[in-house]
């Protein structure tokens, strides 16, 4: 056997046709190398490892109780260049690469404080913006809108993470915008608000609404305006959270765990690192025997639907696949 050069972060199998596997797969309790060398000379059970046995359920084709995948034909479990179409946000959230963040509009009318709590419950906060480009991304999204109804215009007004603090009441109200919640990153602040005479009597703090103007004829997709409103008013709102690993079943995956990313390829297996799939490897599936025309199952690795008129409908070539 020629000397094997695996990439950094990979384990070199001692023998067999599989030569390199991701390093975290070593000593995880599930043999991957054909000669099982990845599970030899491992620490005794119970010793801490950064990627322990509890993580393996998330790995496609290596579930408990089933046979581990067999590998043929190709020497190395192929690393995959990760592409941006793979999900980094749960369903209903919109991903923006520029800030590595996910955004979601909630149309349920809530006051500012309830809206903030709702965002916190989904591991986010009311959105603030660090750049003009980020704001423009948000404005360009086609957020799900309800059927046109009473208050239709107001559906496009969203609580966001700023407050206007009144500092003086001379000829008119004077104040300044502030980020509403500590810990928000560097942000730009909204323009000065207009104050309605009816709302300017007692409140010393107003809350920010971003109004998006999506209209069929609009060429200017970032047409918008800002409002300082009474925080007790009910409004739709915009939450923002850090991007996260999301698996093919739309489950959020924690740091360090294995998963099959949301996207086009159910045969990918990756490690979640800082919200990004890393060290991805792909299984190669054999063509189903005795079937000329077939379609891949979008959710299951190495499962095929035979489209031949006389063919049996379901094939599973995982056993002759390769990771």
């Amino acid at each position: 056997r020629p000397e094997l050069r695996c990439n950094p972060g990979q384990f070199a199998c001692h023998g067999g046709t599989i030569q390199c596997i991701p390093l975290p797969w070593q000593c995880d309790g599930w043999p991957t190398c054909e000669d099982k060398s990845d599970e030899a000379d491992c620490p005794v059970t119970g010793e801490a490892r950064p990627y322990g046995k509890e993580t393996v359920d998330l790995r496609q084709g290596r579930a408990r109780g089933g046979d581990p995948t067999h590998f043929h034909t190709v020497n190395v479990a192929q690393p995959v260049r990760f592409s941006s179409f793979l999900g980094k946000c749960p369903s209903g959230w919109h991903h923006y690469e520029g800030t590595a963040s996910c955004y979601r509009v909630y149309l349920s009318g809530e006051n500012y404080w309830d809206a903030a709590q709702t965002c916190q419950r989904v591991n986010g906060s009311l959105a603030t913006f660090s750049t003009d480009q980020e704001l423009r991304f948000v404005l360009a999204q086609e957020w799900d809108q309800p059927e046109r109804s009473f208050g239709w215009k107001d559906q496009r007004k969203l609580w966001v993470g700023y407050q206007y603090v009144i500092t003086g009441r001379n000829h008119s109200l004077e104040g300044r915008w502030e980020v509403a919640f500590k810990g928000s990153p560097e942000v730009f602040l909204p323009p000065d608000p207009i104050f309605a005479s009816a709302m300017s009597e007692n409140d010393n703090v107003f809350c920010a609404q971003l109004q998006c103007f999506h209209f069929p004829t609009l060429r200017h997709h970032d047409l918008h305006s800002w409002h300082a409103e009474s925080c007790s008013e009910k409004s739709s709102f915009l939450c923002k959270r850090s991007q996260t690993c999301v698996d093919i079943k739309d489950n959020v995956v924690d740091e360090g765990f294995y998963f099959t990313p949301k996207g086009d390829d159910p045969c990918l297996s990756c490690t979640c690192h800082r919200g990004e799939p890393e060290m991805c490897v792909a299984a190669l599936c054999e063509r189903p025997q005795g079937c000329q025309q077939y379609r891949k199952d979008p959710k299951e690795c190495c499962k095929f639907m035979c489209l031949d008129p006389d063919g049996s409908s379901l094939f599973d070539s995982m056993a002759s696949g390769m990771r």
Epitope: D132, F188, P191, D192, H220
Partner: antibody
Framework: EVQLVESGGGLVQPGGSLRLSCAAS????????MSWVRQAPGKGLEWVSV???????YYADSVKGRFTISRDNAKNSLYLQMNSLRAEDTAVYYC?????????WGQGTLVTVSS | QAVLTQPPSLSVSPRQTVTITCSGD??????VSWYQQKPGQSPMLVIY???RRPSGVPERFSGSNSGNTATLTIGGTQAMDQADYYC?????????FGGGTKLTVLG
């Protein structure tokens, strides 16, 4: 108190150029959306251009490619560079704070394009 | 581009109520602002977001907007309300003004 003061208007020949200025006080130009709106003699109001706090700029079709809006944050001022002027650009030019609603206006400066 | 249509002129007696209309296709779907402009002066915002009155604008000014028509109503009109009034909204222009209504207070 918010104040906007325009200057730079005057008589110019067709095809000529002019630069209008708007000095702001009582608020910060760079953190607001600032627009130019014009009014031809005896006519109604016409929006000309806007600059967002983030720097994005937009123009009415009638001036696109000829006019340029800009600002000087240090001077807290707004500008409108007008090139290739036409007779139909004759108007009082107002600088205004805002974008979808204009809450403060300057007193205006008259631009006359005539040979 | 949206076209906002206003009556060119209206007259009203002092202390009466006058309504200035502004019509445009599906105007109720967009927010409308109203401006007052007295001769030789700059425009001044009197209503924004259909029905909101900025600080300092008298209570006699009110607004509404639904269907294809926005209205500015001045209750108990005073001589000082004599001016031109413009409605304004946004469209792909993206900002559009009505042609203006000259309000004359009689007497």
């Amino acid at each position: 108190e918010v104040q906007l003061v325009e200057s730079g208007g005057g008589l110019v020949q067709p095809g000529g150029s002019l630069r209008l200025s708007c000095a702001a006080s009582g608020f910060t130009v760079s953190s607001n959306y600032m627009s130019w709106v014009r009014q031809a003699p005896g006519k109604g109001l016409e929006w000309v251009s806007v600059i967002y706090s983030g720097g994005s700029t937009y123009y009415a079709d009638s001036v696109k490619g000829r006019f340029t809006i800009s600002r000087d944050n240090a001077k807290n001022s707004l500008y409108l560079q007008m090139n290739s002027l036409r007779a139909e650009d004759t108007a009082v030019y107002y600088c205004a704070r805002g974008w979808t609603t204009f809450d403060y206006w300057g007193q205006g400066t008259l631009v006359t394009v005539s040979s | 581009q949206a076209v906002l249509t206003q009556p060119p002129s209206l007259s009203v007696s002092p202390r009466q109520t006058v309504t200035i209309t502004c019509s445009g296709d599906q105007l109720g779907d967009r927010y409308v602002s109203w401006y007052q402009q007295k001769p030789g002066q700059s425009p001044m915002l009197v209503i924004y977001q259909d029905d909101r009155r900025p600080s300092g604008v008298p209570e006699r000014f009110s607004g509404s907007n639904s269907g294809n028509t926005a209205t500015l109503t001045i209750g108990g009109t005073q001589a000082m309300d004599q001016a031109d009034y413009y409605c304004q909204t946004w469209d792909n222009s993206p900002v559009v003004f009505g042609g203006g209504t000259k309000l004359t207070v009689l007497g």
